[in-house]
């Protein structure tokens, strides 16, 4: 049977139906992909340009393949099995009235069905299956895949990868509230914040008094101690860790194969021997890399280092003096760690708004 030979897939909504708000269409496809990612190890990332594995489009009649749409009713959509080019793509008949309710044709339900084909599923003869060839309305808010659907998709891709549990090692390092405590790297990981130091990291939920500690090797045996920079792209469940001239990708708390990779593949010049700190700004969709007195800016959409970088930190981040140990993005602010202190920085107004102890996150 046809299936994708990789876990991380991209999709792009090439055009939008005028029947619905763009943001509703985006949300519906995000949720439709999530239906399948919830029961498999597959992960989906939305592209805004270029060719994606799964291209989604709305079209009337003839639209570039042999399978012309037939006007309102009849064929609602079609999708191709996995593979390059048109394969994997999902086409929706614009002659239908697409909705997010029981009226017209519910886009979410048809999307889940068509994306099933895009992932390699055939039609089912079980009327309870979303892969049954006849459309019928179900309430999207209570929608669940049938046992048949789960069994069929897992026969292609397996069950979801369980994230490893974060456990406390037997001998935690001593107290947080030590005056001179500094961190190697700090980043969010989902709802938690990870504070890396030497061979271990502390992690905690903001606002919760509990602090946990885990050795890096106990959760990720392939990741070295002494991580120097880290950032998270939460929308993709991706965590990037840096040490010297290498970086690692952790997906859903599971290290990706074929890593580490060279930092030079990201566009750094040969003069860069290590990254001091890194932070992803989700509003700008940029990663800021801090290296000595300079910083570099990386565009995650284009997967390219922005031109005209590096630039001086002191010029473009007023009030920030090198050298930087770690940077955390939290609630639209950057928290810039330098030794025993951290600066709360507002990137919108480009100014430092607070000076705090590095350990303030632990109630110190």
């Amino acid at each position: 049977r046809s299936r994708w030979m990789k876990r991380y897939l991209t999709y792009r909504i090439y055009n939008y139906t005028p029947d619905m708000k763009r943001e509703d269409v985006d949300y519906i496809f995000q949720k439709a992909f999530q239906v399948w990612s919830d029961v498999t190890p597959l992960r989906f990332r939305k592209l805004h340009k270029d060719e994606a594995d799964i291209m989604i489009l709305f079209a009337f009649g003839a639209h570039g393949d042999f399978n012309y749409f037939d006007g309102k009713g009849g064929t609602l959509a079609h999708a191709f099995y996995p593979g390059p080019g048109i394969q994997g793509d999902a086409h929706f008949d614009e002659a239908e009235t697409w909705t997010k309710s029981f009226q017209g044709t519910n886009l979410f339900l048809v999307a889940v069905h068509e994306l099933g084909h895009s992932l390699g599923l055939q039609h089912s003869n079980n009327p309870k299956s979303i892969m049954y060839p006849t459309y019928r309305y179900l309430n999207p808010s209570t929608f669940r895949l049938s046992a048949d659907d789960i069994r069929n998709i897992q026969s292609l891709y397996g069950a979801p990868v369980k994230p490893p549990s974060l456990t406390k090692p037997s001998s935690p390092p001593s107290t947080f509230c030590h005056q001179s405590l500094s961190f190697d790297a700090v980043t969010t990981v989902g709802e938690k914040i990870f504070f890396f130091k030497d061979w271990f990291f502390w992690w905690k939920l903001p606002g919760s008094p509990a602090t946990n500690i885990t050795s890096i090797s106990s959760i990720w045996p392939s990741i070295p101690s002494g991580i120097q920079a880290a950032y998270e792209i939460e929308s993709r469940n991706q965590l990037f860790l840096f040490k010297d001239e290498k970086y690692w990708l952790i997906n859903n708390l599971v290290p990706e194969p074929h890593y580490p990779r060279s930092i030079y593949s990201l566009g750094f010049s040969a003069s860069v021997k290590k990254v001091d700190a890194a932070v992803f700004d989700p509003l700008r969709q940029k990663v800021y890399f801090f290296v000595d007195k300079h910083y570099w800016r990386y565009d995650v959409r284009q997967e390219l280092m922005d031109p005209a970088y590096p630039k001086l930190i002191s010029t473009h981040f007023p009030g920030i003096k090198p050298k930087i140990d770690a940077v955390l993005y939290f609630k639209r602010h950057y928290y810039i760690f330098q030794g025993a202190y951290q600066l709360e920085y507002d990137p919108l107004f480009r100014r430092v708004t607070k000076t705090l102890k590095s350990t303030s996150w632990f109630g110190c």
Epitope: E51, D65, F66, N67, H78, G83, I86, Q87
Partner: antibody
Framework: EVQLLESGGGLVQPGGSLRLSCAAS????????MSWVRQAPGKGLEWVSR????????GYADSVKGRFTISRDNSKNTLYLQMNSLRAEDTAVYYC???????????????WGRGTLVTVSS | DIQMTQSPSSLSASVGDRVTITCRAN??????LNWYQQKPGKAPELLIY???SLQSGVPSRFSGSGSGTDFTLTISSLQPEDFATYYC?????FGQGTKLEIK
């Protein structure tokens, strides 16, 4: 290695019939859409007909509709084109071409046979 | 019905030249455009699919771009073996072909 080998071409009089075959090997034939494409002497390429993996769905160019019939025998890994009521303008090299997997045909022809020449002349 | 217009119909160039062939659809075909190369007496060979994806085994001097209605095939530095006829295609519609000849 994917191989497509056409046969059955030849000289036929206007109004006559001919059946072309395409023997496929090197891939799971029953999974793939297949097409016939032709090329008149000194002219460009013209798509003729397509068929789904099961044989249940077919399509034809307007120029051959009602006269040509595409079929397949998955047990023999063979594609066919039955050509009736042949005309002088059907003179061409006929190629069979492998399309993508699955229920729908795309016209992405990644492998072609060497072709077989059909000449319609009195 | 969708129609494909390819230009130029013929083109003379020299080894080492950069060559561009264009293909235009009369309505959007998104990125569903393929390019084929055909040498005399031979079957066509797939070069580019989905407008810009290079078929396995095809030299990197060939590239494709475009989406919607306008597409191009570019050969960055012509080699002697590139002199052939090139066709754009989507589903059952082929362009008229571009014959690339040695100047």
């Amino acid at each position: 290695e994917v191989q497509l080998l056409e046969s059955g071409g030849g000289l036929v009089q206007p109004g006559g019939s001919l059946r072309l075959s395409c023997a496929a090997s090197g891939f799971t034939f029953s999974w793939y859409n297949m097409s016939w494409v032709r090329q008149a002497p000194g002219k460009g390429l013209e798509w003729v007909s397509r068929i789904s993996p099961s044989g249940g769905d077919t399509g034809y160019a307007d120029s051959v509709k009602g006269r040509f019939t595409i079929s397949r025998d998955n047990s023999k890994n063979t594609l066919y084109l039955q050509m009736n009521s042949l005309r002088a303008e059907d003179t061409a090299v006929y190629y069979c071409a492998k399309d993508i997997r699955g229920a729908y045909s795309s016209g992405l022809f990644d492998y072609w046979g060497r072709g077989t020449l059909v000449t319609v002349s009195s | 019905d969708i129609q494909m217009t390819q230009s130029p119909s013929s083109l003379s160039a020299s080894v080492g030249d950069r060559v561009t062939i264009t293909c235009r659809a009369n309505q959007s075909i998104y990125t569903y455009l393929n390019w084929y190369q055909q040498k005399p007496g031979k079957a066509p060979e797939l070069l580019i699919y989905a407008a810009s994806s290079l078929q396995s085994g095809v030299p990197s001097r060939f590239s494709g771009s475009g989406s919607g209605t306008d597409f191009t095939l570019t050969i960055s530095s012509l080699q002697p073996e590139d002199f052939a006829t090139y066709y754009c295609q989507q589903a059952g519609i082929f362009g008229q072909g571009t014959k690339l000849e040695i100047k």
